[in-house]
């Protein structure tokens, strides 16, 4: 049974290949029940979460996970060298930095090792799962009485990745939003004086080494300018 | 079969300009990324200036504002063109397709040209 399998997880054009046993319709067995799904990410090219839900397992199970690269130097079968565990039960693996590949085929294997053959593979393509760690050392420039310039680092190459700026003063209901290149630096040509603005940024490895969907956390916030909240109509909501 | 073709490589003086080409077939320029590598003797293959399907461009701080990567889809040609050479630019040039990162054993290139030689004399 082949099914393509349509994930929110920036896989969208993978295939899934499941093998599930077909049983007579008069007994049914576990090797029927589907395998959970493995959501896979790899954090800032340093090691890879690959994690399923355990828990929609009928009863407590330890399933184990393979993995190898199709049609690559690397297709050899490897077993998970490293488990993550929920209450006890394996509900993910941890691959390092030397096991990740990510412009080569990435083939996931989920087994359940008392019935053999229920068993389901996935095909993911690595370079649209990868998470940058969130942008660090946000600084602030004026560059003239109503201009400033905002500054940030991330710890990977710059050219892999793009950015998204918000900011907001105190009495914002919402926050505004600018998309940046890889130059990470981001200028906001009008500035109230009279007003506090915060700004945060966050990014993704996007459009030049890979096509990831999924945004890094947001950096730890960055204010400027007066205080304004005695007068600020909005703050209490802002901060509920 | 040739799938990545680069051209306009040569010896120019300092301040002078050159204009690479990069043919490929249609397949490959649809695909993620086109750009452009340079490697000078005895040094590490570096990117110079990529462009993306959608058009998002990247320059190396050493080139940016001199150099400009450009895309002509009826043709399936990128284009570096190089203004205000210096000798320091003198380097072997290749075209490449795919994702533009080469990294610690990382590599998302499908598909690389045979190189083109510029020398920039002061």
């Known amino acids: 049974l082949n099914t393509t399998i349509l994930t929110p997880n920036g896989n969208e054009d993978t295939t899934a290949d499941f093998f599930l046993t077909t049983m007579p319709t008069d007994s049914l067995s576990v090797s029927t029940l589907p395998l959970p799904e493995v959501q896979c990410f790899v954090f800032n090219v340093e090691y890879m979460n690959c994690t399923w839900n355990s828990s929609s397992e009928p009863q407590p199970t330890n399933l184990t996970l393979h993995y190898w690269y199709k049609n690559s130097d690397n297709d050899k079968v490897q077993k998970c060298s490293h488990y993550l565990f929920s209450e006890e039960i394996t509900s993910g693996c941890q691959l390092q930095k030397k096991e990740i590949h990510l412009y080569q085929t990435f083939v996931v294997q989920l087994q359940d090792p008392r019935e053999p053959r229920r068993q389901a593979t996935q095909m993911l393509k690595l370079q649209n799962l990868v998470i940058p760690w969130a942008p660090e050392n946000l600084t602030l420039h004026k560059l003239s009485e109503s201009q400033l310039e905002l500054n940030w680092n991330n710890r990977f190459l710059n050219h892999c990745l793009e950015h998204l700026v918000q900011y907001r003063t105190d009495w914002d209901h919402s926050w505004t939003e600018q998309s940046v290149d890889y130059r990470h630096k981001f200028s906001l040509p009008s500035v109230d004086g009279q007003k506090r603005y915060t700004f945060r940024v966050r990014s993704r490895f996007n459009p030049l080494c890979g096509s990831a969907q999924h945004w890094s956390e947001w950096s730890h916030p960055i204010h400027w300018g007066s205080n304004t909240s005695k007068e600020n109509p909005f703050l209490f909501a802002l901060e509920a | 079969q040739v799938q990545l073709q680069e051209s306009g490589g040569g010896l120019v003086q300092a301040g002078g300009s050159l204009r690479l080409s990069c043919a490929a077939s249609?397949?490959?320029?649809?695909?993620?990324?086109m750009g452009w590598y340079r490697q000078a003797p005895g040094k590490e293959r570096e990117l110079v200036a990529g462009?993306?399907?959608?058009?998002?461009?990247y320059y190396a701080d050493s080139v940016k504002g001199r150099f400009t990567i450009s895309r002509d889809n009826a043709k399936n040609t990128v284009y570096l063109q190089m203004n205000s050479l210096k000798p320091e630019d003198t380097a072997v040039y290749y075209c490449?397709?795919?994702?533009?990162?080469?990294?610690?054993?990382?590599?998302?290139?499908?598909?690389w040209g045979q190189g083109t030689q510029v020398t920039v004399s002061s």
């Open positions: 490449a397709a795919g994702y533009l990162l080469l990294w610690e054993g990382q590599d998302g290139h499908d598909y």
């Open positions: 462009i993306a399907t959608g058009g998002t461009t």
């Open positions: 249609g397949s490959i320029f649809a695909g993620p990324a």
